[in-house]
């Protein structure tokens, strides 16, 4: 399922602190004294930015003032800073901060590249792993299921942690964890297949931490179109990492003469990236809610977060739409190469495959198309959204809806074209996937608009969970089941092998249309939910005593 798996897991989250800068500007000097001691004594969830010699530095989570040696520096809200310096004190903003944010976003994007590189390195040497451990197809299915299930289960946990604790530490620990597990898994003896299964589960947990939390930090670093751009860069990581994973897997295997070495590349890079995240990514806070200190955290429980998210119609519908994308990408990634191979058998341009891997050439072409359309889709989606925002405030969900509905048409055409022209089928795949992937970054943006900063990691996690549960965790199996069901009631022939799989895959465009409908539903509620989120944020920046969550 090249380049596709868990795209939706990441897409959805990069939002949290993006609105902060704006709210900070709005709030600057507004409450010089309100709740001064409570607010200035608030505990920071992470370290603050770098403090230059004499002055206060405006960090992404507030401002930090250089304190005389011997006294601890206190991360404070802009209000507190203003109180300390006097109501009219200017707030210097070093030029390095912009570069720092760019570097942080670049490192986070690099981490995402590695996340997918690691995942698809395993995919790239999967045949070797199967061969070495004697893994049957059901065993390979188990490896996939364990990964997805552990990812699904871990995501909400990291969502909870990501909204409450130091995110860059969680991120780094996640990267260190999956790096160590992947590296160790390259030494698993042949007889311990269950250890390989366990390692994939543990890697799923480690990667869930990243996919859930990293986008929310990017959300805190940027606003508006810059955020969309940075999210696009972040989501480029999916096709790039996946493609590089395949390349790394096969090339390292060939160079070293042993597939085990392929599993030792990404962990080394992972350790480096994890360290860079600790050093270069600022310990951003979650909007002004964080700046109100521990008070809000004490008031908002995970259950309350979940209730709020479930009541958020834009979030619910966009999550269901994301599940539809995940369903289609999971099923198409698994079955399209085999379907195209069967099409060629029917067209008499290929032999019936008796010794796997069947459709290896088609897998390669499909993988290349998927990677390229991943890039193209993200660029197209982001560009179209920026253009449409000038014309309508509902641009984000509408662009996604149009992309989904357009994609459904081209996915349908794959099955028409495949009967006569493989090239035609590939063209339809190209256009269909580009449109399908155009919503990756936008879905993340939607989530950021409609979810308040302190709930975003939980929101990403829940979206990740549902998109896997309703999407790619089951779709490949469902398509295979339907195909087998059709074949049982037909005569055994290459034609019916082709047709039965085609009919089963026709479920995908229907689900994609359904996803489009969900995005249209999101468009209906988008403005009101965004307004509600902004209103809640405004409430959160009032003095602590009056906070109501």
């Amino acid at each position: 399922m090249m380049c596709l798996e868990c795209a939706s897991a990441a897409a959805g989250g990069a939002e949290e602190e993006e609105a902060d800068a704006e709210r900070r500007r709005r709030r600057r000097g507004a409450q010089p004294g309100a709740g001064g001691s409570a607010c200035c004594g608030a505990r920071g969830v992470g370290g603050a930015g770098v403090v230059s010699a004499d002055e206060e530095v405006q960090t992404l989570s507030g401002s930090v003032r250089r304190v005389p040696s011997g006294l601890p520096s206190i991360p404070s809200t802009p209000g507190c800073a203003a109180a300390a310096k006097g109501p009219s004190a200017p707030q210097p903003k070093p030029a390095s901060l912009g570069r720092g944010r760019g570097a942080a976003a670049a490192i986070l994007s690099l981490g995402n590249v590695l996340n997918y590189l690691d995942r698809y390195t395993v995919a790239g040497v999967l045949l070797d792993i199967q061969q070495h451990f004697g893994v049957k197809d059901r065993g390979a299915g188990l490896l996939q299921s364990v990964f997805i299930c552990s990812f699904m289960v871990a995501a909400p946990i990291f969502g909870y942690l990501g909204d409450r604790f130091n995110r860059k530490v969680i991120l780094s620990c996640g990267i260190f964890f999956w790096s160590a597990v992947t590296f160790s898994s390259s030494f698993i003896p042949q007889q311990y297949f269950w250890l390989l299964v366990l390692s994939r589960g543990l890697v799923g947990i480690g990667e869930a931490s990243y996919s859930t939390i990293a986008p929310t930090i990017i959300g805190d670093l940027f606003t508006k179109n810059t955020r969309t751009l940075m999210l696009s860069v972040f989501y480029f990581a999916i096709p790039l990492g996946s493609g590089l994973g395949y390349i790394t897997g096969s090339s390292v295997k060939q160079a070293a003469g042993d597939w085990h070495w392929a599993l030792r590349v990404s962990p080394v890079l992972g350790m480096i990236t994890g360290t860079l995240i600790l050093i270069l990514v600022p310990a951003t806070k979650r909007g002004h809610a964080d700046q109100l200190g521990g008070q809000l955290k004490a008031r908002t429980s995970w259950l309350r977060d979940m209730k709020a998210l479930i009541r958020n119609r834009s979030y619910v519908f966009s999550s269901l739409a994301t599940s539809a994308v995940s369903f289609a990408t999971g099923a198409l990634g698994m079955w399209i190469p085999l379907y195209l191979h069967r099409a060629q058998v029917v067209q008499k341009t290929a032999e019936t495959c008796n010794s796997p891997p069947c459709g290896a050439k088609d897998s390669l072409i499909f993988g290349a198309i998927t990677c390229f359309t991943g890039f193209l889709g993200v660029v197209t989606g982001a560009g179209a959204t920026r253009w449409c925002r000038l014309r309508t405030q509902r641009a984000d969900p509408l662009v996604c809806a149009v992309g989904m509905l357009g994609s459904a048409i081209f996915i349908c055409l794959i099955f028409v074209a495949a009967k006569t022209s493989i090239v035609g089928a590939y063209i339809c795949i190209f256009v269909g996937e580009t449109l399908l992937f155009s919503n990756w970054a936008i879905t993340a943006d939607i989530l950021m608009y409609v979810v308040i900063p302190t709930r975003r990691a939980t929101a990403v996690a829940l979206q990740s969970f549902t998109s896997h549960l309703l999407g790619d965790a089951g779709s490949p199996y469902l398509i295979g089941f339907i195909s087998d069901l059709i074949r049982q009631s037909t005569k055994d022939s290459p034609l019916w092998e082709f047709l039965s799989l085609g009919y089963a895959l026709m479920l995908c465009p229907f689900v994609v249309v359904l996803g489009g409908m969900f995005f249209l539903a999101t468009a209906l509620f988008f403005l009101s939910d965004r307004a509600k989120a902004e209103q809640q944020v405004n409430q959160l920046v009032m003095p602590p005593a009056s906070v109501k969550v």
């Epitope: 199967q130 061969q131 451990f133 049957k136 197809d137 059901r138 065993g139 042949q190 007889q191 796997p356």
Partner: antibody
Framework: EVQLVETGGGLVQPGSSLKLSCATS????????MSWVRQAPGKGLEWVAL??????????NYAESVKGRFTISRDDSKRRVYLQMFTLRDQDTATYYC????????????????WGHGVMVTVSS | DIVLTQSPATLSVTPGESVSLSCRAS??????IHWYQQKSNGSPRLLIK???QSISGIPSRFSGSGSGTDFTLRINRVESEDFSVYYC?????????FGSGTRLEIK
């Protein structure tokens, strides 16, 4: 009790063909990978071919010395595994053993846990 | 292909003695080595799997050890029925290969 019984051996001329058959009982044949191993007179053991189960798409693997000349196949309904040998050479003269690999449902081993008694194939002019 | 070298080719012992048979791989193969016993005019039978794991029905006097490239089959207090040919086999990668065998004979 696991049983593997090979048949179809005999004396043949170089260049000719022969098909060996192995009848099995006492284990779940459809889930089990099967191999042929041969032993030339007075020599050591040599693995010839392996055929996997349906859940591994009946993938077949061969030793380099027989690739393109031998074909391994199986019939799950009859619980039989076959070795079709074409273009036989003098050096193919050996006792051919039918063997099974231990199965663990999700994966299989590559070692041979059960062996047949063997069938003699003599290639000579 | 992975080449397995067994030594010695022939080992003469008296019953009751303990012996060690060696198998060396041409490259590291972790613990993917298995040992078989073949009595004269008989079929081979599996003795030890994955270098050291015992097989049910095989006497406890047979034990294996080793990892990487060097492996050993140890027979504690050899009995008369143990005089046979012993083969090691690797399953680290295809093609599956056997060692040339070690013949255990009565001194």
């Amino acid at each position: 009790e696991v049983q593997l019984v090979e048949t179809g051996g005999g004396l043949v001329q170089p260049g000719s063909s022969l098909k060996l058959s192995c009848a099995t009982s006492g284990f779940t044949f459809s889930d089990t990978w099967m191999s042929w191993v041969r032993q030339a007179p007075g020599k050591g053991l040599e693995w010839v071919a392996l055929i996997k189960d349906k859940n591994s798409n009946y993938e077949a693997n061969y030793a380099e010395s027989v690739k393109g000349r031998f074909t391994i196949s199986r019939d799950d309904s009859k619980r039989r595994v076959y070795l079709q040998m074409f273009t036989l050479r003098d050096q193919d003269t050996a006792t051919y053993y039918c063997t099974s690999h231990e199965d663990f449902y999700y994966y299989s081993s590559y070692y041979f846990d059960y062996w047949g008694h063997g069938v003699m194939v003599t290639v000579s002019s | 292909d992975i080449v397995l070298t067994q030594s010695p080719a022939t080992l003469s012992v008296t019953p009751g003695e303990s012996v060690s048979l060696s198998c060396r791989a041409s490259q590291g193969i972790s613990t993917s080595i298995h040992w078989y016993q073949q009595k004269s005019n008989g079929s081979p039978r599996l003795l030890i799997k994955y270098a050291s794991q015992s097989i049910s029905g095989i006497p406890s006097r047979f034990s294996g050890s080793g990892s990487g490239t060097d492996f050993t089959l140890r027979i504690n207090r050899v009995e008369s029925e143990d005089f046979s040919v012993y083969y090691c086999q690797q399953t680290y990668s295809l093609p599956l290969t056997f060692g040339s065998g070690t013949r255990l004979e009565i001194k």
